[in-house]
Interface confidence: low
């Protein structure tokens, strides 16, 4: 229905609390250099222009879009030219085209210091005196360096945040409490983030219709029980919400995704069973948990497939009639049977089916053609099952530093013109799989493995579209989102790579690294060894073991030594000595 | 479960109209593949027009296309067949079958049907 005044209808619908979190988060994801306080001046400007609309809907301006009403904010602030360059060449156009301008600016890969948690005492002061502030802060430094954040997912995260202070902050040892759940919300929070980007590409670059492929396969697998005109109704409007918010329409998105909830918590009983505990949380929870919903129980008496898709006669018929639809119940009936199964896997083989229709209904005697259809899935579906089994075995061996190794050395080796920083960020990014993946029962592993590899994979296409190098790269990234991770699978090592010169000072290191944290000592030596590939991108494990642990022990020993700056600067140069021998 | 209750046959004469009728309960007809069927005395169970569910998509035997249509009206759950220029060949007892939790698509095979009604008689004869 339509509203006089959109921004009032909605402050009215998500209340204030988070209209203001979506307006900060809005602000944040479009100009990420500004800092905290200039942002909090605008949401401040924004709401009480909300409140004036709210009390009389005919108040100047109020029938404005909110594209046009955050726009015109943005193009207001002071020298921004002098800090976002081009950015500022977008308010010279009108809407639509200036939000897309904005769009197309964000950056995936802000020049950001990386995001320094503060000590657990100085933490809990700076929540006790202000916990709003405390909180926008929070809201702000994610949006900012993530950019396509899902944004009623990240007011979730601020309120789970919240959670873990008020808690925590009133213990003895509060950095004991904090740090294992503040760890365990980061890295959600960051899964969520590069899955959230995924789908944002997904409808950039393919748009709504694939899209809605991907969610109709996700929810036949949640709810199995649904029938197919529930899932295109949850589908759709899925759809609707993620475009909302790619697009940055995020205070939309946020009301349009509390709408979802509310119906499906209303229709449970033509969706599924296992949705009653989320359905009696507050609105942010209830979302989360209606999206992290564990699949129901399939029924017990679903006929064969190939009934409908194989054996019917009217197979061609009905594929002609209604194209999508019919692929739309292949791809919902073949996912309501295989929770078991990634999305990704699913989605190849409603294409490989579509593709054998397309064939096979030209030809003169089509369920010949298409009759073997079924059989011919079993490569597609063995190719990632044997990557989940070589891949965890590797990872129960090596544990997750060491397979996260294992990744880089391979990845350089596809792509060694990418930029280190980048291999080394997808290489603990993809390594991090076992530790996600590996313990979970066999029949969620697939669709763990495969998925979130797919995602990070998108970050990687994400980042190298900006400063492409590697054509390899290019070639995976630009084909069908589906399709990427094989292609990447199938890589090998990169022929036409011209080794890069020995540089001495790459491996030359001093006293500093000994106070690094577990974490930054670990990218160091990972920076090493992508370094070291792609100086020897043949060189074999044993050589490339020798070596780093070498390296490790020199590390190790200098940092026990009395003077650490002299162990550095004497050993070092023996080290880069024998790596070079060890390599030659 | 899925009750389904047609009316509407008759006697009617060659290049006659009538109207067949399903009433629904149990289940929103505009949310399940419905079809009408046929049975002619010795003959086998035959597929005349089907809609999906979900989705307004008709389809028709060759042997009754352009002349009968198939609707529903959701508001009063109700499954109709609109049968115009009879022919004798078109007795036989009609049937109306219902498909929900399958794919939103008619398909022709009976067999694929769980919930039918008891049939209305339609007799085309001078």
């Known amino acids: 229905e339509a509203h006089k005044s959109e921004i009032a209808h909605r402050f009215k619908d998500l209340g204030e609390q988070h209209f203001k979190g979506l307006v900060l988060i809005a602000f944040s994801q479009y100009l990420q250099k500004c800092p905290y306080e200039e942002h909090i001046k605008l949401v401040q400007e924004v709401t009480d222009f909300a409140k004036t609309c709210v009390a009389d809907e005919n108040a100047e301006n109020c029938d404005k879009s909110i594209h046009t009403l955050f726009g015109d904010k943005l193009c207001a602030i002071p020298k921004l030219r002098d800090n976002y360059g081009e950015l500022a060449d977008c308010c010279a156009k009108q809407e639509p085209e200036r939000n897309e301008c904005f769009l197309q600016h964000k950056d995936d890969n802000p020049n950001l210091p990386p995001f320094q948690r503060p000590e657990a005492e100085a933490m809990c002061t700076s929540f006790q005196e202000n916990p709003t502030s405390f909180l926008g802060h929070y809201l702000h430094e994610v949006a900012r360096r993530h950019p396509y954040f899902y944004a009623p997912e990240l007011l979730y995260y601020a309120e789970k945040y919240n959670e873990v202070l008020t808690q925590c902050c009133t213990e003895s040892d509060k950095a004991a409490c904090l740090t294992p759940k503040l760890d365990a919300v980061k890295e959600k929070a960051l899964v969520a983030a590069v899955r959230q980007r995924m789908k944002c590409s997904s409808m950039q670059r393919f748009g709504e219709r694939a899209f809605k492929a991907w969610a109709v396969a996700r929810m036949s697998q949640r709810f199995p029980n649904a029938e197919f005109a529930e899932i295109t109704k949850l589908a759709t409007d899925v759809t609707k919400i993620n475009k909302e918010c790619c697009h940055g329409d995020l205070l939309e998105c946020a009301d349009d995704r509390a709408e979802l909830a509310k119906y499906m918590c209303e229709n449970q009983a033509t969706i599924s069973s296992k949705l009653q505990a989320c359905c009696d949380k507050p609105v942010l929870q209830k979302s989360q948990c209606l999206a992290e919903i564990e699949h129901d129980n399939i029924p017990a008496d679903l006929p064969s497939i190939a009934a409908d898709f194989v054996e019917d006669k009217e197979v061609c018929k009905n594929y002609a009639e209604a194209k999508d639809v019919f692929l739309g119940t292949f791809l919902y009936e073949y996912s309501r049977r295989h929770p078991d199964y990634s999305v990704s896997l699913l989605l190849r083989l409603a294409k490989k089916y579509e593709a054998t229709l397309e064939k096979c209904c030209a030809e003169g005697d089509p369920p010949a053609c298409y009759g073997t259809v079924l059989a011919e899935f079993q490569p597609l579906v063995e190719e990632p099952k044997n990557l989940v089994k070589t891949n965890c075995e590797l990872y129960e061996k090596l544990g997750e530093y060491g397979f996260q190794n294992a990744v880089l050395v391979r990845y350089t080796q596809k792509a060694p013109q990418v930029s280190t920083p980048t291999l080394v960020e997808a290489a603990r990014n993809l390594g991090r799989v076992g530790t996600k993946c590996c313990t979970l029962p066999e029949a969620q592993r697939l669709p763990c493995v495969e998925d979130y590899l797919s995602a990070i994979l998108n970050r990687l296409c994400v980042l190298h579209e900006k400063t492409p190098v590697s054509e390899k790269v290019t070639k995976c990234c630009s084909g069908s989102l589906v399709e990427r991770r094989p292609c990447f699978s199938a890589l090998t090592v990169d022929e036409t790579y011209v080794p890069k010169e020995f540089k001495a000072e790459t491996f030359t290191f001093h006293s500093d690294i000994c106070t690094l944290p577990d974490k930054e000592k670990q990218i160091k030596k990972q920076t090493a060894l992508a370094e070291l590939v792609k100086h020897k991108p043949k060189a074999t494990e044993d050589q490339l073991k020798t070596v780093m642990g070498d390296f490790a022990q020199f590390v190790d020993k200098c940092c026990k030594a009395a003077d650490k700056d002299n162990c550095f600067a004497t050993e070092g140069p023996n080290l880069v000595a024998r790596s070079k021998e060890a390599l030659a | 479960e899925v009750q389904l209750l047609e009316s509407g046959g008759g006697l009617v004469q060659p290049g006659g109209s009538l109207r067949l009728s399903c009433a629904a309960s149990g289940r929103y007809i505009d949310e399940t593949a419905v079809a009408w069927f046929r049975q002619a005395p010795g003959k086998e169970r035959e597929f005349v027009a089907g809609?999906?569910?979900?989705?307004?998509?008709?389809y028709y035997a060759d042997s009754v296309k352009g002349r009968f249509t198939i609707s529903r009206d959701n508001s009063k759950n109700t499954l109709y067949l609109q049968m115009n220029s009879l022919r004798p060949e078109d007795t036989a007892v009609y049937y109306c079958?219902?498909?929900?939790?399958?794919?939103?698509?008619?398909?022709?095979?009976?067999?694929?049907?769980?919930?039918w009604g008891q049939g209305t008689l339609v007799t085309v004869s001078s």
């Open positions: 079958a219902a498909r929900p939790g399958r794919p939103q698509i008619t398909s022709k095979v009976a067999d694929l049907y769980p919930y």
């Open positions: 809609i999906g569910g979900g989705v307004d998509i008709t």
